[in-house]
């Protein structure tokens, strides 16, 4: 697994460097998670042909993965810092069950999958400190999550491979949109 942000050799070599601001720390954290997703996608794509699957086949999957929409205030038109931050945190909380599903889906990248999951938890904490309106953030229901996890794990092999691919792809896109918006804040 890659070294968590703030622990690479560059940081050790420059002990007198200014500490990271909260925005820089969040930026670095998201890039770290994106690196992890890249590694996981590599294993997924090497193992199956899901990455070449047509969009039609992907669309048939009824996963309810978080996605940025215009109303979320994270795009330039209608950009709203607080609404967007709430959407990012809510979306990340909703992704947690899917990241849990990924935990037993990798052979050579088991550690990497764990790192992505744990780093996402840390990212959520960073973002919650930044948010003013924590009341607007809805936490997913644990019972609903548990039954969703059971349902996903009961799928046949092909659907499990497809689900893994979709989760990684959607999570990557969600993080990219989130970081682009956070860079405006």
């Amino acid at each position: 697994a890659p070294v968590p942000p703030g622990e690479d050799s560059k940081d050790v070599a420059a002990p007198h460097r200014q500490p990271l601001t909260s925005s820089e720390r969040i930026d670095k954290q998201i890039r770290y998670i994106l690196d992890g997703i890249s590694a996981l996608r590599k294993e997924t794509c090497n193992k199956s042909n899901m990455c070449e699957s047509s969009k039609e086949a992907l669309a048939e999957n009824n996963l309810n993965l978080p996605k940025m929409a215009e109303k979320d205030g994270c795009f330039q038109s209608g950009f709203n810092e607080e609404t967007c931050l709430v959407k990012i945190i809510t979306g990340l909380l909703e992704f947690e069950v899917y990241l849990e599903y990924l935990q037993n889906r990798f052979e050579s990248s088991e550690e990497q999958a764990r790192a992505v999951q744990m780093s996402t938890k840390v990212l959520i904490q960073f973002l919650q400190k930044k948010a003013k309106n924590l009341d607007a953030i809805t936490t997913p229901d644990p019972t609903t999550n548990a039954s969703l996890l059971t349902k996903l794990q009961a799928q046949n092999q092909w659907l499990q491979d497809m689900t893994t691919h979709l989760i990684l792809r959607s999570f990557k896109e969600f993080l990219q949109s989130s970081l682009r918006a956070l860079r405006q804040m």
Partner: nanobody, 124 residues
């Protein structure tokens, strides 16, 4: 990293149009976020616009909003900047940039590959 090459710059009268192209070498073009920056004589390089991998997240600097349009063709490995209603203050060297994380943003530090630039001169 990828190689970037801008083209399409030139001399144009105020109110005219130009289309800049940025050709990218490398198979991973479609995963990159791409941006346009510009640098006027004696000024800092500034953000113009950026576009994500599938063109559904586009940002513009306030100074060009409504006049410039950024787009990309992933099949051809090219990004474009359509510039309409050009003003003398748009005179600058225009650079294209690529972000391998697929994010982009308004600061130079967010991009890891840069082109050499193409000159755009708008005369009054």
């Amino acid at each position: 990293q990828v190689q970037l090459q801008e083209s399409g710059g030139g001399l144009v009268q105020a109110g005219g149009s130009l289309r800049l192209s940025c050709t990218v070498s490398g198979r991973t073009f479609s995963t990159y976020a791409m941006g346009w920056f510009r640098q006027a004589p004696g000024k800092e390089r500034e953000f113009v616009a950026d576009i994500n991998w599938n063109s559904d997240n586009i940002w513009y600097a306030d100074s060009v909003k409504g006049r410039f349009t950024i787009s990309r063709d992933n099949a051809k490995n090219v990004m474009y900047l359509q510039m309409n209603s050009l003003k003398p203050e748009d005179t600058a060297v225009y650079y294209c940039a690529a972000d391998s994380y697929g994010v982009g943003g308004g600061k130079e530090e967010y991009y890891d590959s840069w082109g050499q630039g193409t000159q755009v001169t708008v005369s009054s």
